[in-house]
């Protein structure tokens, strides 16, 4: 299923992407492209991290969320309409055909020319809101075999976690559309 | 810069197990930014992609050799290897191991390649 | 999987003249497309990834054009070192594919 977010000329966007570190610190590389993710890697890389930190990203690409502890979610600032297209978050776990990946929809409407309403919100002020909420829908549970202390459970999609979630309503209010396929 | 070199018998008989190795000289195997993947080429005909094994530890193999496939890698050694299992006369070949840049997949370095055969 | 077909199957040519050569996917790769040249005996060598983009080391006379389902990669003025076989790969869908290949040969 392909997960769409919407955000404004002028606005953060954010885009959703988690897993869960076996113990707090036991990170693995992770990359986000613009472009549908690609055999390997991210096509077009805007930021990439490593086993122990952010390692590369341009100026406009942040990772704001607790990366310690598995949320890779991009924000990108100010973005413009250049920004819409499909983003790829690749989760490279170690082991025989493991990585994750998502491709997420960004789509950039034009700046609002009336005052928003207040029941609007920044795009990324809104979204820290859902690190907290109960997905309903089941987690997918990898075991690695052998590999040592890597034991994921990979939230697989923004749409998982939100699946029958009162936050729904909220996040279209606030431009994001789900589609769960 | 990155270079490598396979080694490994040249005949192998069939049913039995073909393992060829790399050596990876310039670089280390362990360093992130790399990833580390065989290629075969049948006589006189095109290429065919085998698999990889990445700086983070993630693999893929072609789903046709999936089932007989093991790729790894031996850091000490600055090494990584395939291991085909159950060969046939189908797998004689020529084998490349090769290194692919990650950061932006714009230069990749190749073995000479070594051939191998499969007969009785 | 994602097939790709190379044509021509042979390629005619001059040095000084300019080579052109398709490659077709059978599904969209969006730009996730590279080109290899090989010569007999060795191995093969990157040229061009993500469709256009030249890679380290590659003369300016190689480029390469398109995305979704047709490539094409241009050689603009043959050189000698230039006549070899040529395969374009897709990087999009696993497992990766390559074209049958284009044999750019001296006429």
């Known amino acids: 299923s392909e997960v769409e977010y919407r955000a404004e000329v002028g606005q953060n966007a954010y885009l959703p992407c988690f897993y869960t570190p076996a113990a707090p610190g036991n990170l693995v590389p992770v990359c986000w492209g613009k472009g549908a993710c690609p055999v390997f890697e991210c096509g077009n890389v805007v930021l990439r991290t490593d086993e122990r930190d952010v390692n590369y990203w341009t100026s406009r690409y942040q990772l704001k969320g607790n990366f310690y502890k598995g949320d890779v979610s991009l924000t990108i600032e100010n973005v413009t309409l250049a920004d819409s297209g499909i983003y790829c978050c690749r989760i490279q776990i170690p082991g025989i055909m493991n990585d994750e990946k998502f491709n997420l929809k960004l789509v950039i409407k034009p700046a609002k020319v009336t005052p928003a309403p207040t029941r609007q919100r920044d795009f990324t002020a809104a979204f820290p809101r859902m690190l907290t909420t109960r997905g309903h829908g089941p987690a997918e549970t990898q075991t690695l075999g052998s590999l040592p202390d890597i034991n994921l459970t990979q939230i697989s999609t923004l749409a998982n976690e939100l699946r029958d979630s009162r936050l729904a309503n909220d996040l279209r209010d606030s431009g994001a559309t789900i589609r769960i396929g | 810069q990155v270079q490598l070199q396979e080694s490994g018998p040249g005949l192998v008989k069939p049913s039995q197990t073909l393992s060829l190795t790399c050596t990876v000289s310039?670089?280390?195997?362990?360093?992130?930014?790399?990833?580390w993947s065989w290629t075969r080429q049948h006589p006189g005909m095109g290429l065919e992609w085998i698999g990889y094994?990445?700086?983070?530890?993630?693999?893929y193999y072609t789903p046709s050799l999936k089932s007989r496939l093991t790729i790894s890698v031996d850091t000490s050694k600055n090494q990584f290897s395939l291991k085909l299992s159950s060969v046939t006369a189908a797998d004689t070949a020529v084998y490349y191991c090769?290194?692919?840049?990650?950061?932006?997949?714009?230069?990749?370095?190749w073995g000479q390649g070594t051939l191998v055969t499969v007969s009785s | 999987e994602i097939v790709l077909t190379q044509s021509p199957a042979t390629l005619s040519l001059s040095p000084g003249e300019r080579a052109t050569l398709s490659c077709r996917a059978s599904?969209?790769?969006?730009?996730?497309l590279a080109w290899y040249q090989q010569k007999p005996g060795q191995a093969p060598r990157l040229l061009i990834y993500d469709a256009s983009n030249r890679a380290t080391g590659i003369p300016a006379r190689f480029s390469g054009s398109g995305s979704g389902t047709d490539f094409t990669l241009t050689i603009s003025s043959l050189e000698p070192e230039d006549f070899a076989v040529y395969y374009c790969q897709q990087r999009s869908n696993w497992p990766l594919t390559f074209g049958g290949g284009t044999k750019v040969e001296i006429k």
């Open positions: 599904q969209s790769v969006s730009s996730y």
């Open positions: 310039g670089g280390s195997i362990s360093s992130g930014g790399y990833y």
């Open positions: 090769a290194s692919l840049d990650s950061w932006g997949s714009n230069r990749d370095y």
């Open positions: 094994i990445s700086y983070s530890g993630s693999i």
